[in-house]
């Protein structure tokens, strides 16, 4: 049943006597695995026997091993990967015919036929050309040979007129179940000179022997190939001479259809033959002549013939590479004066005066300067005479404003807060100055062009610069305004000790200021409105808590005085002046409450208290208040307290508490 089998192979395999064949083959069977494979040569089906008969080239065994048999026939497939590829090496003419692949599975049988065509001699390859070859259009030439075999090496070689072609060919080999072939592809740009030439594709064996070949004649379509001849030979003529030009068509495929003549690229009217005659030439007939001949491929133009009609220089004109030109740029002047032959000598004029040493068509100034501005004209000379000097061309040289300076219009000195007027001046400019710029930029008033008014000038307006601007800005050297102002940034700074101030320390305070103009200053120190000193430093040899407070310093110069922010001087000291106070008095009746309070003066405040009795025994109380409740007669005695902060300790003097009996106690007794 054919629907159960799917076998792929090229169908027909071509070879020649002594070569080999390689038959790529794959199969699929829907029902079970392939059990038996037999390769027949020209199999015939015997109806009576219900089986195929013929020469058996190969037969598989149960275990898939190859039997001894035809050595030149090799079955290269296997059952595992469904491959049925085979080869015959060498192959002979009488191998031509059908190869029958008999395939048997558990339930199905199939006979697949492959045609084998073995010729006596190597058959030629086939050259395939594109339908149209046109000059300079790259095409691919293909040489196809319906043969490929792993055991037999071949080569395809290209020749043009019997000479190997230099272009690199690409050879493709196919040994697939779809097709078996060897193909050589050659990229080729045909030239008109290739027209009618023979291209050969040769089939070579491994030793380079030519086995067969195919030849084609190239039909390269091309535009006409032209040459032009002039009579008389000389193309330099005088006005009134006659000239004949002949257009020769050396090759054309297909034949040419039209002819025309061009002068300086423009077609000449009613000139459509291969010969052009110019009678009594005039100056205007000088130019480049060529003929144009067309065929179906397209038009072709001959080389140009430069016909020169000689005449003396005409009135000159000067062409300037740039005007206006920027100062410092390169400027080229060109003297244009039609003449034939070309002028050999030029004379240049600047504002009517001859420029010495300049005798060429082009006059170059590498770096143009303001004084180069003006009118430039020239005269040209050739063997036929000197031309007329034209009217000249104007050169404008532009440059930034020159010698820009700035002037302070104010009487000096300038004080902070004054109104200052500045003017910006320059010596020359091209184009004219159209605006001014100022540095630094500020919300300043410009009452007139080039004048700047700074209202309420700041202390730090040190330097101002102006620029006069046309297309460019030229800056003046900055002018220092020298603004006078009272001292700034006044502050009190502790210079010693570096850490916190403890009672008894040596202390120095510095009166700092960031700037002052003028520089000469005086200092004043005050505390709570009282003047302390007139130096930049305020020194305490041994600071006491009484020195703590709010300090300010003043710095003054001839313009004014400036005070610092108040600076608080804090002195740290151990608890002092401790005393024990009793809110209820120092005589208390038993049974009542006795409250003792430890009073102290300390910075920072006391964080820990201790209480002691008359025997210096520590009492189990640690607060500022010692409460005895109910108080007993035995509590009578002297008490003292001790206070501690992070600077140190202090203790109070003794204070006596007297506890007397209550009337009840006295009554009981």
């Amino acid at each position: 049943d054919s629907s159960k089998w799917n076998i792929e192979h090229p169908g027909t395999i071509y070879a020649w006597e002594g070569a080999c064949v390689w038959v790529p083959c794959t199969y699929r069977v829907l029902d079970g695995a392939l059990e038996t494979f037999i390769l027949f040569h020209n199999p015939e089906y015997n109806q009576n026997m219900s089986k195929f008969e013929g020469t058996r080239l190969y037969e598989s065994t149960k275990d898939g091993k190859l039997p001894s048999g035809q050595k030149r026939v090799q079955f290269l497939g296997n059952k595992i990967n469904n491959n049925c590829t085979l080869s015959i090496h060498p192959v002979h003419v009488n191998d031509s015919g059908q190869l029958g692949l008999r395939m048997v599975s558990k339930t199905e049988k199939w006979m697949e036929r492959i045609h084998l065509n073995v010729s006596e001699r190597p058959f030629p390859p086939r050259i395939q050309l594109p339908p149209k070859l046109q000059e300079s259009q790259e095409v691919t030439l293909t040489c196809l040979l319906n043969f490929s075999c792993y055991g037999y090496q071949i080569q395809l070689q290209w020749l043009l007129e019997g000479v190997p072609m230099r272009q690199a060919a690409v050879t493709l080999t196919s040994l697939s179940t779809k097709s078996v072939f060897t193909r050589s592809e050659l990229k080729f740009s045909p030239q008109w000179s290739h027209h009618g030439k023979i291209v050969t594709c040769e089939l070579h064996d491994v030793d380079g022997k030519v086995l067969s070949e195919d030849m084609v004649q190239l039909n390269v379509k091309h535009t006409p190939k032209l040459t032009i001849e002039v009579t008389p030979n000389e193309t330099t003529v005088r006005k009134g001479d006659s000239v004949t030009m002949t257009c020769k068509v050396n090759s054309s495929n297909p034949e040419y259809t039209t002819v025309s003549w061009l002068k300086d690229g423009i077609p000449l009217k009613e000139q459509n033959t291969l010969m052009l005659t110019l009678h009594k030439v005039t100056k205007s007939q000088s130019g480049r002549y060529c003929c144009r001949v067309s065929n179906d491929v397209g038009p072709a133009t001959s080389e140009k013939v430069f016909l020169q009609v000689q005449y003396a220089p005409e009135s000159s004109r000067v062409q300037i590479s740039q005007s206006p030109a920027v100062e410092g740029s390169e400027v080229n002047f060109l003297c244009i004066s039609p003449a034939n032959p070309l002028p050999t000598n030029y004379t240049w004029y600047h504002n009517g005066k001859e420029v010495q040493g300049r005798t060429e068509k082009q006059f170059q100034i590498q770096k143009i300067l303001p004084w180069h501005a003006g009118t430039y004209s020239c005269e040209a000379e050739n063997i036929l005479g000197i031309g007329e000097r034209g009217p000249g061309t104007e050169l404008d040289v532009q440059y930034p404003p020159k010698k820009v300076t700035m002037v302070i219009e104010n009487p000096t000195p300038i004080r902070e807060g004054d109104t200052v007027t500045l003017s910006c001046n320059y010596s020359s400019s091209n184009p004219i100055v159209n605006h001014y710029e100022w540095r630094p930029r500020g919300a300043w008033e410009e009452p007139s062009l080039g004048v700047l008014k700074i209202q309420n000038i700041g202390w730090n307006n040190t330097a101002v610069a102006c620029a006069a601007c046309n297309n460019w800005c030229s800056w003046a050297s900055p002018v220092t305004l020298n603004v006078l102002y009272a001292p700034r940034g006044v502050r009190v700074r502790k210079i010693k000790p570096l850490s916190e101030i403890h009672s008894g320390n040596s202390v120095s305070l510095q009166c700092d200021f960031s700037s002052s103009h003028p520089k000469e200053v005086q200092f004043f120190w005050e505390k709570n409105g009282s003047l302390l000193g007139k130096e930049s430093q305020l020194n305490f040899d041994s600071i006491s808590p009484e020195d703590a407070g709010s300090y300010s310093c003043w710095v003054n110069n001839s313009i004014g005085q400036t005070a610092s922010k108040a600076w608080t001087l804090e002195v740290l000291y151990a608890p002092r002046r401790l005393r024990v106070s009793m809110s209820q008095g120092n005589q208390v009746m038993e049974g009542k409450t006795a409250t003792l309070i430890c009073e102290s003066d300390a910075n920072p405040p006391v964080y820990s208290y201790a209480w002691f009795d008359w025997n210096n025994q520590s009492l189990p109380y640690s607060g500022r208040m010692l409460r005895l409740e109910p108080v007993k007669v035995q509590h009578s005695g002297a008490y003292w307290c001790q206070g501690t902060n992070r600077v140190g300790k202090g203790h109070s003097p003794l204070i006596t508490l007297t506890v007397y009996y209550s009337p009840q106690t006295i009554g009981r007794r």
Partner: antibody, heavy 123, light 106 residues
Framework: QVTLKESGPGILQSSQTLSLTCSFS??????????VSWIRQPSGKGLEWLAH???????RYNPSLKSRLTISKDTSRNQVFLKITSVDTADTATYYC???????????????WGQGTTLTVSS | DIQMTQSPASLSASVGETVTITCRAS??????LAWYQQKQGKSPQLLVH???TLADGVPSRFSGSGSGTQYSLKINSLQPEDFGSYYC????????FGGGTKLEIK
């Protein structure tokens, strides 16, 4: 009165960078067309032009030394500078700065020269 | 680029003689040529600019001439102070200075 004066280190080691200063007076390098060149002369040899700077800060260099040279100016301080990188014993020479005055057309020449500063490069 | 070729490289002459030093440019330099004199241990000094204009203070025995590509410096009646090296220079050529001519006392 136009004067130019060169100053430099006198002695350098190979591979160091040479810094030269030309201080001038009597003219301004902001004047149109004005320029200053550096020229050197190895002992007993000819003049070798190195670099030129114009009033407009355009700079020209000797092509064979261009990669090693940097010319600059400070117009306000009337100074021109030349830096030569990676010096070698072949750079041992007297170094001159010279003024090129504004030309009529394009004919730059040197009308005033400094006295020269000597450089010795030791390996 | 224009090249400057100065000749001769050296020259011996006596006081009172006339000598000529030439400078050839590989292209037209339009008269923009200068000549310098350098004495031993001194800076070069400008003698001539624009091919033929004598610099201020230069004695009239010195003269420059030429055009296009050929230029020369002529010293009439050589004086003892004229001995030294002479250089031609065209700013736009590379290099701008000629190789120099050493003028020595014979």
């Amino acid at each position: 009165q136009v004067t130019l004066k060169e100053s430099g280190p006198g002695i350098l080691q190979s591979s160091q960078t040479l810094s030269l200063t030309c201080s001038f007076s009597g003219f301004s390098l902001s004047t149109s067309g004005m320029g200053v060149s550096w020229i050197r002369q190895p002992s007993g040899k000819g003049l070798e032009w190195l670099a030129h700077i114009y009033w407009d800060d355009d700079k020209r260099y000797n092509p064979s030394l261009k990669s090693r040279l940097t010319i600059s100016k400070d117009t306000s301080r009337n100074q021109v500078f030349l830096k030569i990188t990676s010096v070698d014993t072949a750079d041992t020479a007297t170094y001159y700065c010279a003024r090129a005055p504004p030309p009529n057309w394009d004919e730059y020449y040197f009308d005033y020269w400094g006295q020269g500063t000597t450089l010795t490069v030791s390996s | 680029d224009i090249q400057m070729t100065q000749s001769p490289a050296s020259l011996s002459a006596s006081v009172g003689e006339t000598v000529t030093i030439t400078c050839r440019a590989s292209g037209n330099i339009h008269n923009s040529l200068a000549w310098y004199q350098q004495k031993q241990g001194k800076s070069p000094q400008l003698l001539v600019h624009n091919a033929k204009t004598l610099a201020d203070g230069v004695p009239s025995r010195f003269s420059g001439s030429g055009s296009g590509t050929q230029y020369s410096l002529k010293i009439n009646s050589l004086q003892p102070e004229d001995f030294g090296s002479y250089y031609c220079q065209h700013f736009w050529s590379t290099p701008p200075f000629g190789g120099g001519t050493k003028l020595e006392i014979k």
